[in-house]
Interface confidence: low
């Protein structure tokens, strides 16, 4: 005697999220009479996916008309697949009765959902760091399936190697997340640099997703200070120049002090950008030497991006022979420096 078989020809089906999944099922006999039902999972907790008899299943469409008397094809199409639909689906034949009795189940078809990773989001450090320091950038992407994924980091097109990547969860899941942290050593030339996190996944058909972060958000390039004095003018006025160069970001305050007293404070604004993204600024102070009897200590004080102030000082010695005034050499580039000018 020929026994009814329920055949599910595919052991597994893989579908991209948003697409439809077709789950095939054939019953080899019209006898005995009774409905077919589809379940996800096994045992008492299994989930009813489709029933010929009853219920509302808006996303499920039978491939063939199950009401036709001679129908033996009980394949279904599930629309708009999401990662939550992953699992093993069973086509089950029931014998008509009160209640219906489960007769035979197919071997099951595992549905795996290929879900695209979300656009990678790259976040940088909360506070700026200076050149030669190492900063961390984090890249996150979520919601992808299957779990296999490749993540690469680039800085200005060059692949980075110092990074750690985790894919969660470790076990089986309907979808996964990836988190990677890259360590990047900053240089003074990095204002225009960019880090890119590139995620490659089977769902992307060779078109990886990229997330970017600009190092301009993470870097602080402290200024160089150079204080110089021009030749004394005929009217006994000395023009002292404070050159503040190669700094980023633009937020900078410059204060001139004469003998420790604030003479003038200026804020940098609308400065032209250097090719490397940094800024330069020059400030002048005109000092009337004849108005001073004693030496004049001039200090150019620069506060950059909320950092402690950097000072450069000159001691201008009031001379009996002002016309012999020469030009002073630049002060040192660090710390507080004093020069006597004769």
């Amino acid at each position: 005697e020929e026994e009814l078989q329920v055949i599910q020809p595919e052991k597994s089906v893989s579908v991209a999220a948003g697409e439809s999944a077709t789950l095939n099922c054939t019953a080899t006999s019209l006898i005995p009479v009774g409905p077919i039902q589809w379940f996800r999972g096994v045992g008492p907790g299994r989930e009813l996916i489709y029933s010929q008899k009853e219920g509302h299943f808006p996303r499920v469409t039978p491939v063939s008309d199950p009401t036709k008397r001679n129908n033996m094809d009980f394949s279904i199409r599930i629309s708009n697949i999401t990662p939550a639909d992953a699992g093993t689906y069973y086509c089950v034949k029931f014998r008509k009765g009160s209640p219906d009795v489960e007769l035979k189940s197919g071997a099951g078809t595992e549905l795996s959902v290929r879900a695209k990773p979300s656009a990678p989001v790259v976040s940088g450090p909360a506070v700026r760091a200076t050149a030669e320091h190492t900063v961390s950038f984090t890249c996150e992407s979520h919601g992808f399936s299957p779990r296999d994924i490749t993540l690469k980091w680039f800085k200005n097109g060059n692949e980075l190697s110092d990074f750690q990547t985790n894919v969660d969860p470790a076990g089986k899941s309907v979808s996964y997340s990836i988190r990677s942290t890259a360590r990047v050593v900053l240089t003074r030339r990095d204002v225009h640099s960019q880090v890119i996190c590139e995620v490659a996944h089977v769902t992307l058909q060779g078109d990886p997703l990229r997330g970017t972060a600009n190092l301009s958000e993470a870097i602080r390039v402290p200024p160089f200070l150079e204080v110089t004095q021009q030749s004394m003018r005929a009217d006994n006025q000395v023009n002292v120049t404070c050159q503040v160069t190669k700094f980023y970001p633009q937020r900078l305050q410059l204060t001139w002090l004469e003998n420790g007293n604030v003479s003038r404070t200026e804020m940098a604004s609308a400065l032209p950008e250097n090719k490397d993204g940094t800024y330069n600024w020059t400030s002048w102070l005109l000092v009337n030497v004849s108005a001073h009897r004693d030496d004049v200590k001039l200090t150019c004080q620069v506060e950059h991006d909320g950092q402690p102030a950097v000072n450069k000082s000159f001691s201008v010695k009031v001379s009996a022979h002002p016309k012999e005034q020469g030009s002073n050499t630049a002060a040192e580039n660090t710390g507080t420096n004093e020069r006597n000018i004769y």
């Epitope: 999220a17 697409e19 695209k116 225009h192 970017t212 600009n214």
Partner: antibody, heavy 121, light 107 residues
Framework: QVQLQESGPGLVKPSQTLSLTCTVS??????????WSWIRQHPGKGLEWIGY???????YYNPSLKSRVTISVDTSKNQFSLKLSSVTAADTAVYYC?????????????WGQGTLVTVSS | DIQLTQSPSSLSASVGDRVTITCQAS??????LNWYQQKPGKAPKLLIY???NLETGVPSRFSGSGSGTDFTFTISSLQPEDIATYYC?????????FGGGTKVEIK
């Protein structure tokens, strides 16, 4: 409410460089959160996306035009610009500047009124 | 590049009619799709973003649906001021691309 206004010559000779500027008012380019794009429309035809720039200077150009396109930004003037080199009659179009949400959810939610550029000798 | 195929390319309908435009993507773009309205001599105006979300200030007679590769734009009751060309645009992949447009006219 942000407004965008294109400006530049309406006539460009073949082989020369087309230069357009988009001035943004009612919002700051440098506040972030948006891409600043150029889109063009050939007479009686559909829309073609040219590329975008972020306030930081990051750009992406349509590969079909990449070799000829430069988009730049001047945050101090709240402007961004398009340069298209080696133009031909096929570059005759209405050029639009537009603002697009960085997260992609809001589309090009603000556009300029467009400026017609004719390439002819 | 992602191709977006809009259909029909033009249609003529009466005031009060329900108008439906479709946009098919050459590959899965999830719901990363916008719909624009462009009136003659004007810049495009965003109507629908993320396939189904109505942009602020846009009349509720406009709607959108779909996900993956097949999308639909509907005007539930056509008004004279709706005479325009309508474009779909994908932003799932760079470069962003537009559909060829659907010109809507009044009978």
């Amino acid at each position: 409410q942000v407004q965008l206004q294109e400006s530049g010559p309406g006539l460009v000779k073949p082989s020369q460089t087309l230069s357009l500027t988009c001035t943004v008012s009612g919002g700051s380019i440098s506040s972030g959160g948006y891409y600043w794009s150029w889109i063009r429309q050939h007479p009686g035809k559909g829309l073609e996306w040219i590329g975008y720039i972020y306030y930081s200077g990051s750009t992406y150009y349509n590969p079909s035009l990449k070799s000829r396109v430069t988009i730049s930004v001047d945050t101090s003037k709240n402007q961004f610009s398009l340069k298209l080199s080696s133009v031909t009659a096929a570059d005759t179009a209405v050029y639009y500047c537009a603002r697009e949400g960085l997260d992609g959810s809001y589309g090009s939610s603000a556009w300029g009124q467009g400026t017609l550029v004719t390439v002819s000798s | 590049d992602i191709q977006l195929t809009q259909s029909p390319s033009s249609l003529s309908a009466s005031v009060g009619d329900r108008v439906t435009i479709t946009c098919q993507a050459s590959q899965d773009i999830s719901n990363y799709l916008n719909w624009y309205q462009q009136k003659p001599g004007k810049a495009p105006k965003l109507l629908i973003y993320d396939a189904s979300n109505l942009e602020t200030g846009v009349p509720s007679r406009f709607s959108g649906s779909g996900s993956g590769t097949d999308f639909t734009f509907t005007i539930s009751s056509l008004q004279p001021e709706d005479i325009a060309t309508y474009y779909c645009q994908q932003f799932a992949y760079l470069p962003y691309t537009f559909g060829g447009g659907t010109k809507v006219e009044i009978k």
